[in-house]
């Protein structure tokens, strides 16, 4: 069909991984498909098998090397193909010229920890994972705190417009359980998007001291 509902989307984690999602309405769940990567200025080719993630979408990760190796640069173009098996042959279903540093999605921040907690405040730090040294300090973060009786979707977003891998949460309620998440995004790249949210970090504020407000 013209204007069919196929979609092929890929992101580069800035180091050695390209993650792709292929969706096509009406495709059979047991269809065997793969993504093939063909760089314009590298000697390697890479393939990954698309595995079902929902009724009509499949995903896979092109592992280009060791997790922290810098496998692509801003000048690279990688031609990505979706190939699906039809009978005895592979058929190209979609093809994309992929500029890695225009299509970035970093790994979720890791190693979240409470540095210091008080009755009304909590200082939290984290680390970024597998992020290219090319970014230097050109990263931004969003954070959110889950309060009792609320959902993550209701949590206000806190924006850090610089590479700051810590935050001091203020105006918290004493002796209360919270959860905290953070995500990261490079400033570079026309189609760049936010990383997944980090694993939530649970923490509890200290109880108020009897007889005084801290």
């Amino acid at each position: 069909a013209v204007n069919g509902t196929s979609q092929f989307t890929c992101f580069y984690n800035s180091r050695a991984n390209i993650s792709c999602v292929w969706s096509q309405d009406g495709a059979l769940q047991d269809t065997s498909c793969q993504v093939h990567a063909w760089p314009d200025r590298r000697r390697w080719n890479q393939t990954c098998e698309l595995l079902p993630v929902s009724q009509a979408s499949w995903a896979c990760n092109l592992i280009l090397g060791a997790p922290d190796s810098q496998k692509l640069t801003t000048v690279d173009i990688v031609t990505l193909r979706v190939l699906c098996r039809e009978g005895v042959r592979w058929r190209v279903m979609a093809i994309q010229d992929f500029k890695p540093f225009e299509n970035l999605r970093l790994m979720a921040p890791i190693s979240l920890q409470v540095v210091h907690v008080e009755t009304h405040r909590c200082n939290i730090s984290w680390e970024i994972s597998q992020a290219s040294h090319y970014f230097e300090r050109h990263l931004e973060f969003e954070a959110r705190t889950l309060s009792p009786g609320h959902t993550w979707e209701e949590a206000p977003l806190l924006t850090l417009k610089q590479k700051q891998e810590w935050i001091c949460l203020e105006t918290l309620t004493p002796d209360t359980q919270y959860e905290f998440q953070v995500r990261v995004k490079p400033l570079q790249g026309e189609f760049t998007t936010w990383s997944p949210w980090s694993q939530p970090l649970a923490f509890r504020t200290k109880p108020a001291a009897l007889g005084k407000d801290t």
């Epitope: 069919g4 096509q24 994309q96």
Partner: nanobody
């Protein structure tokens, strides 16, 4: 949205060749996948060929693979369809189309804009 104007159609004998051109106006052409479709009288419009924005990747319908070649010149904002070994069943109106900016090219095309078409007639 790019404006597309096809040219190069005409009457040709079976076994002959034609080269269709599609001139695009618009600043986004060099980052858009481009397509050729065709529509024979009384039939649905069908996919013929597609090319990625850099020109590195191409897709063809089974019926034209090995006979037709899609190419592009981003400096001239033009996409081409070289048609060799033409057959009577290639007779159709041929349409140039542009996919969304930065998108992949699909066998089931996602189309942003269409040309008005150029007629190709192959006589036996």
């Amino acid at each position: 949205e790019v404006q597309l104007v096809e040219s190069g159609g005409g009457l040709v004998q079976a076994g002959g060749s034609l080269r269709l051109s599609c001139a695009a106006s618009g600043s986004t052409f060099s980052r858009q996948p481009m397509y050729w479709f065709r529509q024979a009288p009384g039939k649905e419009r069908e996919f013929v060929a597609a090319i990625t924005w850099s020109g590195r990747g191409t897709l063809y319908a089974d019926s034209v693979e090995g006979r037709f070649t899609i190419s592009r010149d981003n400096a001239k904002n033009t996409v081409y369809l070289q048609m060799n070994s033409l057959r009577p069943d290639d007779t159709a109106a041929y349409y140039c189309a542009a996919g969304p900016y930065g998108d992949a090219a699909y066998r089931h095309g996602r189309i942003d804009s269409w040309g008005q078409g150029t007629q190709v007639t192959v006589s036996s």
